[in-house]
């Protein structure tokens, strides 16, 4: 129960890649307005969006200060024009979010081959070492910096000429393989987080093929 | 618990085909890499393909490319071997294993194994 | 494709006996080497992943190593339910290969 024409929010979902992290929310209001609280299990309740009429908040801010704890938010409803207003429990009415731990549950962003470089039948392609929102000493850190070796990345490569998609892995951002001479490859690739049981892997990033500006050919 | 169930084989004659099954449960396939192994009777383990079945890519051994495909229904969290114009060197157990997807780890889990065999 | 040499192609050996499988790769694959144990009419079980690291639930009389393209299976005392056949496994590159499979009998 609730004052009149207050709704409490529902469908509390967290949407969250690579740390950037919002909570979404229903409905969209008619005349009522939300205030986000977020909380780690041990720690106080602290207050984003205040009285706003959107149905997210970005609690980025929040989530990268500790990324393996576990947060969980709630949604309060208010009275549009009327914040003081409470529901008849002397409360206003809010919903509680699932817990999330953005460590183990934000989505692996779409990776980026930065380039490829043959040299004789090797190739060597490096993958971009995305930026976060994660700060440590008031720097941000890569996606290696927060996952460490718990993050993998799967290279999937293939002649222009052919469908079958050969696969390698490494625990860096480095690639180095085989090739037949004189072909040309198609590269793309796919974070992995093989620890996790859920969003284990990314989307892949866009096919990069030899031949193109990112690439550089050397014959030895 | 992880477990995958390999079914759909049986007798089939040269040039004929097969459908095999492999549906797993304890895990989502999607997160994941399903592969095909084959052992024939008395021999050692082949390895016959793999598919991601997130982004549907694929690789085949040379002895069964163009013949065989892999494919997979992540709504039903099964992965197949449709397998075409089937010789009697096809005759196997076939086995479709987890790839854990790590650097370090890769076929953790197995299916029972269910048997082709490619007999006139 | 890469060659998973592996030797010897069978074996007798007693209960309690140390027993080594070695397996030669025909480039290098770095650690990426596994062992699986397989009993007749059941499916491989990983024994060993990434050259020397024991899976789990595995006991701990089962080791592995690897010196170059060279890898090693040891099973330190043999038991009764060890007497099966293991197959290494390179993943370096696709495809991935097996080694020819070393069957432990009774001696």
């Known amino acids: 129960s609730g004052t009149t024409n207050t709704v409490a929010a529902y469908n509390l979902t967290w949407k969250s890649t690579n740390f950037k992290t919002i909570l979404e929310w229903e409905p969209k209001p008619v005349n009522q307005v939300y205030t986000v609280q977020i909380s780690t299990k041990s720690g106080d309740w602290k207050s984003k969006c205040f009285y706003t009429t959107d149905t997210e908040c970005d609690l980025t801010d929040e989530i990268v200060k500790d990324v393996k704890q576990t947060y969980l938010a709630r949604v309060f409803s208010y009275p549009a024009g009327n914040v003081e207003s409470t529901g008849s429990a002397g409360e206003p009415l809010y919903e509680n979010s699932p817990e999330f731990t953005p460590y183990l549950e934000t989505n692996l962003g779409q990776p980026t081959i930065q380039s490829f470089e043959q040299v004789g039948t090797k190739v060597n392609v490096t993958v971009e070492d995305e930026r976060t929102l994660v700060r440590r000493n008031n720097t941000f850190l890569s996606l290696r910096d927060v996952f460490g070796k718990d993050l993998i990345y799967t290279l999937y490569y293939w002649k222009s000429s052919s469908s079958g998609k050969k696969t390698a892995k490494t625990n860096t951002n480095e690639f180095l393989i085989d090739v037949d001479k004189g072909e040309n490859y198609c590269f793309s690739v796919q974070a992995v987080i093989p620890s996790r049981t859920v969003n284990r892997k990314s989307t892949d990033s866009p096919v990069e093929c030899m031949g193109q500006e990112k690439g550089e050919f050397r014959e030895i | 618990e992880v477990q995958l169930v390999e079914s759909g084989g049986g007798l089939v004659q040269p040039g004929g085909s097969l459908r095999l099954s492999c549906a797993a449960s304890?895990?989502?396939?999607?997160?994941?890499?399903i592969h095909w192994v084959r052992q024939a009777p008395g021999k050692g383990l082949e390895w016959v393909g793999y598919?991601?079945?997130?982004?549907?890519?694929?690789y085949y051994a040379d002895s069964v490319k163009g013949r065989f495909t892999i494919s997979a229904d992540t709504s039903k969290n099964t992965a197949y071997l449709q397998m075409n114009s089937l010789r009697a060197e096809d005759t196997a157990v076939y086995y479709c294993a987890r790839d854990y997807g790590s650097w370090r780890i890769r076929l953790d889990y197995w299916g029972q194994g269910t048997l082709v065999t490619v007999s006139s | 494709d890469i060659q998973m040499t592996q030797s010897p192609s069978s074996l007798s050996a007693s209960v309690g006996d140390r027993v080594t499988i070695t397996c030669r790769a025909s480039?290098?694959?770095?650690?990426?080497v596994a062992w699986y144990q397989q009993k007749p009419g059941k499916a491989p079980k990983l024994l060993i992943y990434?050259?020397?690291f024991l899976y789990s639930g595995v006991p701990s009389r089962f080791s592995g190593s690897r010196s170059g393209t060279d890898f090693t299976l040891t099973i330190s005392s043999l038991q009764p339910e060890d007497f099966a056949t293991y197959y290494c496994?390179?993943?370096?590159?696709?495809?991935?290969?097996f080694g020819q499979g070393t069957k432990v009998e009774i001696k």
């Open positions: 598919i991601d079945p997130y982004n549907g890519y694929t």
């Open positions: 304890g895990f989502t396939i999607s997160q994941y890499w």
């Open positions: 496994q390179q993943h370096y590159t696709t495809p991935p290969t």
């Open positions: 990434s050259a020397s």
């Open positions: 480039q290098d694959v770095n650690t990426a």
